[in-house]
């Protein structure tokens, strides 16, 4: 007969590291006779046998937490007692590890130059994540104006124009990295006149052009006042380049006047205004009387629903204030424009435009948009829509913008990657693959290229003649 033996814990509990939602197991091997009763505590509170979050096996020697939660952190003890000698106890800690998570991501911010901007980035994780920021394509360096706060937020004092751009925060610990979506910091600048109109002394009946140049963010609007009232005659020509607006007021001078250029831009509910004035006097008047980094999300729109794959993950460009609505509006406008094109061209153009405006998101380093393969773009341009494309280019050269494809947001084929160089660098258009399998004859195409140079889509028994000389780089 076996002699009674007080319990001895042969494998003391150790610290266990576990990721959230993973399994964590404590082992408490006990030698004793008779068999002990083993109970478990967490932070000195008894774990109930019927608690479904735990599994207790091997006569109580194995405690398994089936799906670890943040709140499971703590000290776990096993207590073994068989009535011989005293109860014995061994304790170990559960450290819940957590990949970084951005709980309060940054949001788009508009700020007036000179003020302070704060982009939030609150994170969770264990070990505590370090937070850094990326601006555009580069890691953001801290300086006397720019600091990453303890909270992870980015603070920019005395915001300058060059601070504008796309930012994302990066939370990193030993378990992984989390990226926020790109947000836009827009720096607004009060309207300022760079070039004031010049005063003129002219003869009666001559033409004068008054020029006023202003800068600001957003780009200001320029209005003209003549002797305190809105200009009633004359023509105004405006151009905008690099946030500079250039307004030219051409006047037919029949009387003298004071002309004021007013540059205005809006910052939220407030306006900023700058003014400059010039006089136009008439020589010998008394005698005479006589001038685009975004996010990936499922496509929820309607226009491209039949063209894009079901539940397609597509890229939304955050250079638009409301990307999903803005891109849907663009495609909606394009769709109406396509009513004017041929039945051969239209579905191919629809496939091209939908996949260009709503680019497929590819995984990999971080989900990013995949452009259309150059070969498919060229197939639409030079095969399916050759006539329309030629007509469009002809109209563009002659300055005729009326109907057809000229308003469409079409990609520049030469700037797209080739699937022959990297088939994973770009998106194919399944419609075109299907079409080339099923269409046996195409209408004759009058193209600037020889017909043999139609782009090389994936090999099949199609009527696409392919020239090996067709360079796809």
């Amino acid at each position: 007969e076996k002699l009674p033996k007080a319990p001895v814990i042969t494998t003391p509990l150790e610290t266990v590291d576990a990721l959230v939602e993973e399994v964590a197991t404590f082992m408490c091997a006990v030698e004793s006779y008779p068999q002990p009763e083993i109970s478990w505590t967490r932070n000195k509170i008894l774990i109930k046998l019927f608690d479904t979050r735990y599994s207790i096996r091997e006569n109580g020697q194995l405690l398994t937490i089936l799906s670890v939660e943040d709140s499971d952190d703590g000290i776990y003890c096993c207590i073994a007692n068989n009535g011989v000698g005293g109860a014995v106890e061994s304790c170990g800690a559960l450290q819940v590890k957590m990949k970084p998570k951005i709980t309060r991501p940054p949001i788009n911010v508009k700020i007036i130059e000179g003020l302070k901007a704060v982009l939030p980035c609150t994170t969770m994780g264990n070990p505590k994540p370090s937070v850094s920021w990326i601006k555009g394509d580069n890691a953001l360096r801290e300086n006397s104006r720019i600091a990453v706060l303890e909270s992870g937020s980015l603070r920019i004092h005395n915001v300058q124009k060059e601070d504008a751009g796309q930012y994302r925060c990066v939370a990193k610990n030993s378990l992984g990295t989390a990226y926020s979506k790109l947000v836009k910091l827009e720096v607004e600048v009060f309207a300022r006149i760079l070039r004031a109109p010049e005063s003129h002394n002219v003869t009666f009946g001559s033409f004068v052009t008054l020029r006023c140049t202003a800068i600001g963010i957003p780009v200001p609007t320029i209005s003209w006042i003549e002797n305190g009232n809105a200009v009633s005659s004359g023509s105004i020509q405006e151009s905008v380049k690099d946030r500079v607006i250039d307004s030219r007021l051409q006047l037919f001078i029949t009387k003298p006047g004071l002309y004021t250029c007013i540059a205005t831009n809006k910052h939220g509910e407030k306006f900023s205004t700058a003014k400059a004035a010039a006089t136009v006097s008439i020589a010998e008047w008394s005698k005479s009387q006589k001038d685009s980094q975004g996010y990936c999300a499922q496509y929820r729109g309607e226009v491209c629903d039949a063209v894009l794959a079901k539940d397609a993950l597509v890229f939304f460009n955050t250079s638009y204030r409301d990307p999903e609505d803005a891109q849907e509006l663009l495609i909606h406008t394009a769709w109406n424009e396509l009513k004017a094109v041929s039945p051969l061209c239209r579905p191919a153009a629809e496939a091209l435009l939908c996949n260009h405006l709503f680019q497929e998101c590819s995984p990999g380093v971080v989900p990013t948009p995949m452009p259309i393969c150059r070969e498919y773009c060229l197939a639409v341009k030079e095969l399916f829509c050759a006539k329309e494309w030629q007509a469009m280019e002809g109209k563009a050269h002659r300055g005729l913008y009326r109907s057809g494809m000229h308003l469409l947001p079409v990609p520049e084929c030469s700037k797209l990657p080739s699937m022959h160089r990297d088939p994973t660098a770009c998106t194919r258009l399944p419609y075109l693959d299907y079409k080339k399998e099923n269409i046996t004859t195409f209408p004759s195409i009058t193209s600037s290229r020889p017909s043999a140079d139609i782009p090389n889509l994936p090999a099949s028994t199609s009527s696409f003649a392919v020239s090996p000389a067709y360079s796809m780089t």
Epitope: Q293, Q298, D311, V365, P417, R421, D422, P423, T424, A425
Partner: antibody, heavy 115, light 113 residues
Framework: EVQLVESGGGLVQPGGSLSLSCVAS????????MNWVRQAPGKGLEWLSV???????YYADSVKGRFTISRDNVKNTLYLQLNNLKPEDTALYYC?????????WGQGTQVTVSS | EIVLTQSPNSVTASVGEKVTINCKSS????????????LNWYQQRPGQSPRLLIY???TQQSGIPDRFSGSGSATDFTLTINSVQPEDAAVYYC?????????FGQGTKVELK
């Protein structure tokens, strides 16, 4: 025809630095993702780094903080700066074109780290 | 990081035989929205650079003989060489392009009798 020609390898002491280059031809370099992959003698392939079309870079943990990938789209050249080299960095270093697959490979340049 | 495990480590076959290599991923490498598996297969002949055989788990790279085919989805993938030829003696690697860091399997050596 796509060509990737690596250079810059050689013998270097532990703790030393090297700069590898890869000259690309036969394709519009700026439109494609580029990678570095290495192979230690008699061992398997190890992916090191990728650089996207906007010059954003990503690294394997084994080289993070020591190696830097960059590109010059004007010169059609991919670079890998290797700092604080260790004997276990001894390998044949390949320059590779590809986004989610490694499509075209160079012939490689040998880096030997030894005292 | 995603771990890829290839089996077997080596295989010896006669010309004309069918060779099957498996690759198991520790996580899904399939994107739900487009159902593509970002799993690639490479061949490395002795003294040569690797070359891409299969991408997206089953799409054959251009210029690759038809005897090479890929199959599988989510976490289990297979490279099949139908009617193996002498020039197929090489090491074959699987690799995932789903999530950085991109990772390779340990390789499978195919030898011919």
């Amino acid at each position: 025809e796509v060509q990737l020609v690596e250079s810059g390898g050689g013998l270097v002491q532990p703790g030393g630095s090297l700069s590898l280059s890869c000259v690309a031809s036969g394709f519009t370099f700026s439109l494609y993702y580029m990678n570095w992959v290495r192979q230690a003698p008699g061992k398997g392939l190890e992916w090191l780094s990728v650089i996207d079309t906007h010059s954003i870079a990503y690294y394997a943990d084994s080289v993070k903080g020591r190696f830097t990938i960059s590109r010059d789209n004007v010169k059609n050249t991919l670079y890998l700066q290797l700092n604080n080299l260790k004997p276990e960095d001894t390998a044949l270093y390949y320059c590779v074109l590809g986004r989610t697959a490694l499509v075209r490979w160079g012939q490689g340049t040998q880096v030997t780290v030894s005292s | 990081e995603i771990v890829l495990t290839q089996s077997p480590n080596s295989v010896t076959a006669s010309v004309g035989e069918k060779v099957t290599i498996n690759c198991k991923s520790s996580q899904r490498v399939q994107l739900g929205s487009n159902q593509k598996s970002y799993l690639n297969w490479y061949q490395q002949r002795p003294g040569q650079s690797p070359r891409l055989l299969i991408y997206y788990a089953s799409t054959q790279q251009s210029g690759i003989p038809d005897r090479f085919s890929g199959s599988g989805s989510a976490t289990d993938f297979t490279l099949t060489i139908n009617s193996v030829q002498p020039e197929d003696a090489a090491v074959y690697y699987c690799q995932q392009g789903y999530s950085a860091p991109f990772t390779f399997g340990q390789g499978t050596k195919v030898e011919l009798k």
